[in-house]
Interface confidence: low
């Protein structure tokens, strides 16, 4: 199994970044770290989407990766999509210093995110608490600013 993965995030605008993934044991947590720049200050939804298809930009990546057919939630919630990684926070310089540990995504098996698309969104993810139907699907995180396919790393 792969123990490391990487994703280069690119978009039509100024948002770009590199995100790394590391999983030391097949059933262990995945460390997610890196940096994204060109964002507006504040929270931005951060999700793994189902398809590794960026032929039409980030829109062709499909919905959140959700193999268990659950409702959208936050990374700490029982009810969540596998791809729900919550929010990243950009500082006043527009840089998000990403440092996440997640026990639902994996680099192998049914929850494998390799070959799928990582997306950073325009707005904050409400973590499924927004009170409308869109909240239970996307967290009302808005448009897709930048994305990239997650690939096996050395």
């Amino acid at each position: 199994m792969a123990t490391k993965a990487v994703c280069v995030l690119k978009g039509d605008g100024p948002v770009q970044g590199i995100i790394n993934f590391e999983q030391k044991e097949s059933n262990g947590p995945v460390k997610v770290w890196g940096s994204i720049k060109g964002l507006t200050e504040g929270l931005h939804g951060f999700h793994v989407h189902e398809f590794g298809d960026n032929t039409a930009g980030c829109t062709s990546a499909g919905p959140h990766f959700n193999p268990l057919s659950r409702k959208h939630g936050g990374p700490k919630d029982e009810e969540r999509h596998v791809g729900d990684l919550g929010n990243v926070t950009a500082d006043k310089d527009g840089v998000a210093d990403v440092s996440i540990e997640d026990s639902v995504i994996s680099l192998s098996g049914d929850h494998c995110i390799i070959g799928r698309t990582l997306v950073v969104h325009e707005k904050a993810d409400d973590l499924g608490k927004g009170g409308n139907e869109e909240s239970t699907k996307t967290g009302n995180a808005g448009s897709r600013l930048a994305c990239g396919v997650i690939g096996i790393a050395q």
Partner: nanobody, 130 residues
Framework: QVQLQESGGGSVQAGGSLRLACVAS???????????MGWYRQAPGKEREGVAT????????YYSDSVEGRFTISQDKAQRTVYLQMNDLKPEDTGMYYC????????????????????WGPGTQVTVSS
Amino acid sequence: QVQLQESGGGSVQAGGSLRLACVASGGDTRPYITYWMGWYRQAPGKEREGVATIYTGGSGTYYSDSVEGRFTISQDKAQRTVYLQMNDLKPEDTGMYYCAAGNGALPPGRRLSPQNMDTWGPGTQVTVSS
């Protein structure tokens, strides 16, 4: 390749303060990855250890337990300079202080590790007497 030059070292009594500076020159600006820069120290006969690091693309700072609350790392992006303000200095803070830069995103728990830094300055000596 980035070059680093430290300044500000010296001798001080316990309880005193010093401010170290590290100026970065040269090097390319990578499109995606910004630098981590940090301060490391090496006491005579001991291994080099991390003191504090800062994420130059943003505002993330990390400190070793031994200096948390006493030392502050900061930066002047326009001048490409990283500072280490050292207050309430103790004799055990004595050593050669090195500035270092790492050209990548570092995972949690490794942000103070010297192995993650690929460029080093020549160092500046700090001596704290009791």
